[in-house]
């Protein structure tokens, strides 16, 4: 969480951003809030990116003002007009690119004053893993698959019964480059699994951590997946 305050002239207003991550090829949100102001016509929202000459986005006098927008963001940005009223200046970024990573500034002007805060935006690929029983294998085997990751993640297996056990000797992980030549499909196989146990396949890079759980009993198979973005700190 980054909290910024305005400087000089008018009063300063508090602007708050939250570091976040974007999943390449999908839409992302750059989060920013400010002290709401009743005079809507005076609210100006500017998004800037370090190292980029033009603006990322500008919202002024109730509408988008994109004459100064940098080419790399053309047609890819939007603010949520009805949310501006409650002090939400978050930016929607369409079709996130690897090159969108960097330091952004959310700069706000209202009738009460000015303020800004920076935001670190990471980009990569992350997806939910699915763990299944591999019935084609000769022994009891689990197969963990996740379609899109970047940068290359680590994969670790764990089990509820054998807590702390190292499964690296009885597992095999491969990374297959996807057709767009950036993201990779993650496939990890765990051998010699025992029944009535819960196994977890944990995939992690510096952007996200995802876990796929599977519980295999005589009568049923239960699955659960969870994905968590890392380094979501507010400013």
């Amino acid at each position: 969480l980054i909290i910024g305050f305005g400087i000089s002239g008018r009063h300063s207003i508090t602007v708050t951003t939250v570091a976040s991550a974007g999943n390449i090829g999908e839409d992302g949100i750059l989060s920013c809030t400010f002290e709401p102001d009743i005079k809507l016509s005076d609210i100006v929202i500017q998004w800037l990116k370090e190292g980029v000459l033009g603006l990322v986005h500008e919202f002024k006098e109730g509408k988008d003002e994109l004459s100064e927008q940098d080419e790399m963001f053309r047609g890819r940005t939007a603010v949520f007009a009805d949310q501006v009223i409650v002090g939400n200046a978050s930016l929607r970024l369409k079709n996130v690119q690897l090159t969108d990573a960097g330091t952004y500034k959310c700069y706000i002007i209202t009738s009460k004053g000015k303020g800004n805060a920076n935001l670190e935006y990471k980009t990569g690929a992350f997806s939910m893993p699915e763990v299944n029983v591999d019935y084609n294998a000769s022994s009891e085997t689990l197969r963990c698959e996740a379609p899109r990751w970047f940068p290359q993640p680590t994969v670790v297996w764990a089990s509820q019964v054998d807590q702390g056990a190292n499964f690296s000797e009885v597992s095999n992980t491969s990374f297959e480059l996807n057709s767009e030549n950036v993201t990779m499909k993650v496939v990890s196989v765990l051998y010699n699994v025992t029944i009535n146990n819960t196994y977890s396949c944990m995939i992690e890079n510096d952007i996200a951590k995802a876990t796929g759980d599977i519980k295999v009993t005589e009568s049923e198979i239960k699955r659960r997946s969870h994905l968590q973005l890392l380094n979501s700190k507010a400013s």
Partner: antibody, heavy 116, light 107 residues
Framework: QVQLVQSGAEVKKPGSSMRVSCKAS????????ISWVRQAPGQGLEWMGG????????NYAQKFQGRVTITADKSTSTAYMELSSLRSEDTAVYYC?????????WGQGTLVTVSS | EIVMTQSPASLSVSPGERATLSCRAS??????LAWYQQKPGQAPRLLIY???TRATGIPARVSGGGSGTEFTLTISSLQSEDFAVYYC?????????FGPGTKLEIK
């Protein structure tokens, strides 16, 4: 001087619709949102919804969704609030106010009585 | 939606004394809170916004405080015109919601 002038009191039959107007100064209309808040006899304040002509947005409270329509006529700087399928519980004073997010100027209120 | 509660429902205070009214939000509203005063037969009047900023024309004896979920409105040295109903309102999220009000009565 900021003024919000509302239409007069009305008596309505259950099942019918009501429409209350709120005339504001040009500056108010072009720079601020206009919200509608109602107050049943002896009760508290209830936000119904609001419009921000400058943003081209309108928001409604879930409770009134589908039954309330808030519109704005920029040419006359007038906001309207229409409530349909009226029932006795809709008997209240209806206020227009300048704002959200908060409300710094209020209309004089319009009493709408729903009775058969 | 964010639910606002106010306490006490009514408060009897003598003129010249101090009154403290409380408002609680069901989740954090940061400082996005306003206070209104309403007298019988009149429209509400904005007293405080941003939890602690006095609206235009509001005397210094009226003050607001708090952030997050707990807020107070304090009126020091009560005068006859202060006896009314007071409402808090959050504007952190849609829909905007009001508290049920606190009636400030003359003791």
């Amino acid at each position: 001087q900021v003024q919000l002038v509302q239409s007069g009191a009305e008596v309505k039959k259950p099942g019918s619709s009501m429409r209350v107007s709120c005339k504001a100064s040009e500056d108010t209309f072009s720079s601020y949102a206009i919200s509608w808040v109602r107050q049943a006899p002896g009760q508290g304040l209830e936000w119904m919804g609001g419009t921000a002509p400058i943003f081209g947005t309108t928001n409604y409270a879930q409770k009134f969704q589908g039954r309330v329509t808030i519109t704005a006529d920029k040419s006359t700087s007038t906001a309207y609030m229409e409530l349909s399928s009226l029932r006795s519980e809709d008997t209240a004073v209806y206020y227009c106010a300048r704002g959200g997010p908060y409300f710094d100027y209020w209309g004089q209120g319009t009493l709408v009585t729903v009775s058969s | 939606e964010i639910v606002m509660t106010q306490s006490p429902a009514s408060l009897s205070v003598s003129p010249g004394e101090r009154a403290t009214l409380s408002c609680r939000a069901s989740q954090s509203v940061s400082s996005n809170l306003a206070w209104y005063q309403q007298k019988p037969g009149q429209a509400p009047r904005l007293l405080i916004y941003g939890a602690s900023t006095r609206a235009t024309g509001i005397p210094a004896r009226v003050s607001g405080g708090g952030s997050g979920t707990e807020f107070t409105l304090t009126i020091s040295s009560l005068q006859s015109e202060d006896f009314a109903v007071y409402y808090c309102q959050q504007y952190k999220n849609w829909p905007f919601t009001f508290g049920p009000g606190t009636k400030l009565e003359i003791k």
